[in-house]
Interface confidence: low
C-alpha cells in the first residue's frame, strides 16, 4: 500500500494525460483524485502506465468504490482489468453486454482466467439465465464455453439460446452435457423441415434417446459415421439393423471399420447373426442363429 | 510452458490396482480441465476420465465407471486416477492430459505402461 503523502506543489492532476506516466507512485497517489480518475478511465488504456503505476490508479479506484465499481467505471477499465482479483470482481454488477465484451476484448487470446469465469459467472446470473446475446458472445471468445459448463449451468440455457451454437462449440462436450442440451436444440428446431432439422440438430444427438434415433431412421439423413461415433450406446443398442442401416445410408458401409469400437461393438453384439450378415459387410459377433434373447430389463420392470 | 509427466504405472494382476499420479507444472493458474486418456497398441486415444478444475465435477465412460477415480490437489498440482478392479483390458499407455478451461484437450504427458496380466 502507498504512503499518503501530500502533493507537491503544481502536481495535481487537473486531467488524466500522459504526463502521469512520469509521476512516481508516490505523486500518483498524492496527485490523482479517485473522482476525476473515475470519470476519465477511457483515457488509463490509451496512457502506457507500468504495471507498478495501474496498481496504485486501482488502489484509488478501491477506496472510492469499496463495495465495487459502478458498471460506468467497469466497462472503461480496459487493461486494468487484468489487476482485478476474483474477489473484487464478485462485488460487481454488470447488467450490459457492451460492458461484458469490453472486458473480454482485454483478455482476448488468452486461456479463460479465474478473472474471466468470475465475471462471466456474475454477468449470466445477473440475467438469470444464459440468453442468446450473451451465448453468441461468450462462443465468440472462447468457442467451448458452453463444454466448460457443469450440466446444472446448462439447465439455465434457454432453448431460444440454442440457435446460437455452432457445431464446434460442442466439440469438447461430454455426454452428460449432451443429455441436458439435446433436449433444448429438439425443441429449438421442432419447427424446421426434416432435412434441415436434421443438419442443426446432428451436433446434439450424442443427447439423443432410443426413439428418437428411431425416429430419424424413417427420414432419409443419411447419418455420418463421425456422428453415429458419438451416439449414447445405451440409445444405440435396441436399434435394429434396418433401423441403423436406414439411419446410416450409404454411410451403413463405414461400420466394418469401426466394429470394434464402441458404439458399434457392443451394437453388432446384440443384433442376430443373419441380420449382420444382410447388410453383407462382413460383420462379425452377433447372436449365432438359433439361440434364445432374454430381455431381462422388461422382466424386472415388470415385477 | 506446461509440462505433465505420469508415474505409478506398471505391470499388476487382474483384479488388482493401481494408483496414476500426474505432476503438472509451467501453468498460469489452476484454470485447466485434467483428463486421464489410454491406447492400447493398435487402438485409438480414449479418454478415460476427467475432471473440470472448477467445480471437480469428473467425467467416466461406462467401460470404467465404478472402477476408475480421478482426483485432483490443486495445491500440489497433481492428478490422480485410482485404478480398482483391473481387467486384462485395461491393458494400454496411460497419458495424462489437460485442457484450457472449455477448449480441446492440448497439453499431454509422455505416458506410463501399464499392464494387466497374470
Known amino acids: 500500500e502507498v504512503e499518503k503523502t501530500a502533493c507537491p506543489s503544481g502536481k495535481k492532476a487537473r486531467e488524466i494525460d500522459e504526463s502521469l506516466i512520469f509521476y512516481k507512485k508516490w505523486e500518483l497517489e498524492a496527485c490523482v483524485d479517485a473522482a476525476l480518475l473515475a470519470t476519465q478511465m477511457d483515457r488509463v488504456n490509451a496512457i502506457p502506465f507500468t504495471y507498478e503505476q495501474l496498481d496504485v490508479l486501482k488502489h484509488k479506484l478501491d477506496e472510492l468504490y469499496p463495495q465495487g465499481y459502478p458498471e460506468s467505471v467497469i466497462q472503461h477499465l480496459g487493461y486494468l482489468f487484468l489487476k482485478m482479483s476474483p474477489e473484487d470482481i464478485r462485488k460487481w454488477n454488470v447488467t450490459s453486454l457492451e460492458t461484458l465484451k469490453a472486458l473480454l476484448e482485454v483478455n482476448k487470446g488468452h486461456e479463460m482466467s479465474p478473472q474471466v469465469a468470475t465475471l462471466i459467472d456474475r454477468f449470466v446470473k445477473g440475467r438469470g439465465q444464459l440468453d442468446k446475446d450473451t451465448l453468441d458472445t461468450l462462443t465468440a471468445f472462447y468457442p467451448g464455453y458452453l463444454c466448460s459448463l457443469s450440466p446444472e449451468e446448462l439447465s439455465s440455457v434457454p432453448p431460444s439460446s440454442i440457435w446460437a451454437v455452432r457445431p464446434q462449440d460442442l466439440d469438447t462436450c461430454d455426454p452428460r452435457q449432451l443429455d441436458v442440451l439435446y433436449p433444448k436444440a429438439r425443441l429449438a428446431f421442432q419447427n424446421m423441415n426434416g432435412s434441415e432439422y436434421f443438419v442443426k440438430i446432428q451436433s446434439f444427438l450424442g443427447g439423443a434417446p432410443t426413439e428418437d434415433l428411431k425416429a430419424l431412421s424413417q427420414q432419409n439423413v443419411s447419418m455420418d459415421l463421425a456422428t453415429f461415433m458419438k451416439l449414447r450406446t445405451d440409445a444405440v443398442l435396441p436399434l435394429t439393423v434396418a433401423e441403423v442401416q436406414k439411419l446410416l445410408g450409404p454411410h451403413v458401409e463405414g461400420l466394418k471399420a469401426e466394429e470394434r469400437h464402441r458404439p458399434v461393438r457392443d451394437w453388432i453384439l446384440r443384433q442376430r447373426q443373419d441380420d449382420l450378415d444382410t447388410l453383407g459387410l462382413g460383420l462379425q459377433g452377433g447372436i449365432p442363429n438359433g439361440y434364445l434373447v432374454l430381455d431381462l430389463s422388461m422382466q424386472e420392470a415388470l415385477s | 510452458e506446461v509440462q505433465l509427466v505420469e508415474s505409478g504405472g506398471g505391470l499388476v494382476q487382474p483384479g488388482g490396482s493401481l494408483r496414476l499420479s500426474c505432476a503438472a507444472s509451467?501453468?498460469?493458474?489452476?484454470?485447466?480441465?485434467m483428463g486421464w486418456f489410454r491406447q492400447a497398441p493398435g487402438k485409438g486415444r480414449e479418454l478415460v476420465a476427467s475432471i473440470n478444475s472448477f467445480d471437480s465435477i469428473t467425467y467416466y465412460p461406462d467401460s470404467v465407471e465404478g472402477r476408475f477415480t480421478i482426483s485432483r490437489d490443486n495445491a500440489k498440482r497433481m492428478v490422480y486416477l485410482q485404478m480398482n478392479s483391473l481387467r486384462a483390458e485395461d491393458t494400454a499407455v496411460y497419458y495424462c492430459?489437460?485442457?484450457?478451461?472449455?477448449?480441446?484437450?492440448?497439453?499431454w504427458g509422455q505416458g506410463t505402461q501399464v499392464t494387466v496380466s497374470s
Open positions: 492430459a489437460a485442457r484450457k478451461k472449455g477448449l480441446a484437450f492440448s497439453y
Open positions: 509451467g501453468f498460469t493458474s489452476n484454470f485447466y480441465s
